[in-house]
């Protein structure tokens, strides 16, 4: 039995649970998902039994090997998978455990602006980047373009301080998860701040 294998898949995609064995006479191979039987294979008997009929079209064995390919992945396929290789030549079954994380392809992140102030010709605010559907394991970074050197900022909140008269800047939020990334619409500092330009000491949401 090897260490737990961590696998990552995307909704609608496929993942292969790698499995090899040099056992000559394999009596059966049993795959389970969160303790529920998924597939039972009898290589010598030539039979493959998929416990739930709806999974039949999703199960495959690349190149006729022992590895299990699961396609048309859904979010709720995330969980613990376990395989046991049973053979009369083994004193106890050979086992392997896998943890599968299924992630959605990220949609365009949404940007909201916090309280804005404009003091002494400097526009100060925060931009917050978030996913509308609360997707998991999302990492946010900000790209600030337009100054002499382009800058990056980690985290969902970007503090902005932009002085009127400086060259315009563009802010873009990048949202990433283990299977995809997406970009917010670009935000121009001048446009962002012009709402507060008329009143040098104003604050707005």
């Amino acid at each position: 039995s090897g260490p737990v294998k961590e696998l990552v898949g995307s909704v609608g995609g496929a993942v292969t649970f790698p499995l090899k064995s040099k056992v000559k006479q394999v009596d059966s191979i049993v795959w389970t998902f969160n303790t529920t039987p998924l597939v039972t294979i009898q290589p010598e008997g030539g039979t493959i039994i998929v416990t739930q009929n709806r999974n039949r079209e999703r199960v495959d064995f690349p190149d006729g090997g022992y590895s299990l390919k699961l396609s048309k992945l859904k979010k709720n396929d995330s969980g613990i998978y376990y395989v046991g290789i049973y053979s009369s030549s083994l004193q106890q079954p050979s086992t392997q455990e896998y943890v599968l994380h299924v992630y959605e392809h990220l949609s365009k992140p949404k940007v909201t602006m916090g309280l804005q102030s404009n003091k002494n010709g400097t526009c100060v605010t925060n931009l917050t980047c978030c996913m509308e559907h609360g997707e998991e394991d999302v990492i946010y970074t900000w790209k600030a373009l337009g100054q002499a050197a382009n800058e990056s900022h980690n985290g969902s909140i970007l503090p902005i301080s932009w002085r009127w008269g400086e060259s315009d800047m563009t802010f873009i939020c990048v949202a990433r998860n283990p299977v995809s990334r997406n970009f917010s619409s670009p935000i121009l500092a001048r446009k962002l701040c012009e709402g507060a330009a008329d009143d040098p000491d104003s604050s707005m949401v």
Epitope: I41, P43, G46, R56, G64
Partner: antibody, heavy 120, light 108 residues
Framework: QVQLQQSGPELVKPGASVKISCKAS????????MNWVKQRPGQGLEWIGR????????KYNGKFKGKATLTADKSSSTAYMQLSSLTSVDSAVYFC?????????????WGQGTSVTVSS | DIVMTQSHKFMSTSVGDRVSITCKAS??????VAWYQQKPGQSPKLLIY???YRYTGVPDRFTGSGSGTDFTFTISSVQAEDLAVYYC??????????FGGGTKLEIK
């Protein structure tokens, strides 16, 4: 990639023996069953038997016991089939074919075939 | 030994047609049936194993179904390159494995 390369055509006399070879590459030769299949001209397929190169274990179709002898050499990844006491009914194309792991009776890679002609 | 019977030795079809080839086992072989394609002058090629599992790289127009004693191999939309002989084979439990007599698919 998996390849099975068989020896060339044989023309043999009745009563003689012949040994044909099948050299495997691109996979773990020792841990997959190797099958042999006969096809007479214009006819169907007949399973002769199989060998597990890892330990030399063999399984034969009863019809070919005493006719075919299967062996394997792990060091050269080569399987052999010897056919003895040949008669005209042994004239055929003989294929070696690897078993899949998931269903050991299904054969996924085949050699190009070796033609054996028995004639005086 | 288990006898595999393919009732049609020849089948004629047109490009784009759907065609089904049947195979009957003389006793219950569960789902342990494979289908092979053999083109003239070539080695057989595995298409389907365990009755309905398409081998890697095989186009999805080829499908297999059945269990027990009755099995069907279907080409959903025949292509010119599908001209070949198709064999069923039982790979159930203890050998010997046995093949059907083959069905030659001819294109009209």
């Amino acid at each position: 990639q998996v390849q099975l390369q068989q020896s060339g055509p044989e023309l043999v006399k009745p009563g003689a023996s012949v040994k044909i070879s099948c050299k495997a590459s691109g996979y773990a030769f020792s841990s997959s069953w190797m099958n042999w299949v006969k096809q007479r001209p214009g006819q169907g397929l007949e399973w002769i038997g199989r060998i597990y190169p890892g330990d030399g274990d063999t399984k034969y179709n009863g019809k070919f016991k005493g006719k075919a002898t299967l062996t394997a050499d792990k060091s050269s990844s080569t399987a052999y089939m010897q056919l003895s006491s040949l008669t005209s009914v042994d004239s055929a194309v003989y294929f070696c074919a690897r078993s899949t792991m998931i269903a050991t009776g299904a054969m996924d890679y085949w050699g190009q075939g070796t033609s054996v002609t028995v004639s005086s | 030994d288990i006898v595999m019977t393919q009732s049609h030795k020849f089948m004629s079809t047109s490009v784009g047609d759907r065609v089904s080839i049947t195979c009957k086992a003389s006793q219950d072989v569960s789902t342990a049936v494979a289908w092979y394609q053999q083109k003239p002058g070539q080695s057989p090629k595995l298409l389907i194993y365990s009755a309905s599992y398409r081998y890697t790289g095989v186009p999805d127009r080829f499908t297999g179904s059945g269990s027990g004693t009755d099995f069907t191999f279907t080409i959903s939309s025949v292509q010119a390159e599908d001209l070949a002989v198709y064999y069923c084979q039982q790979h159930y439990s203890t050998p010997p494995y046995t093949f059907g007599g083959g069905t030659k698919l001819e294109i009209k």
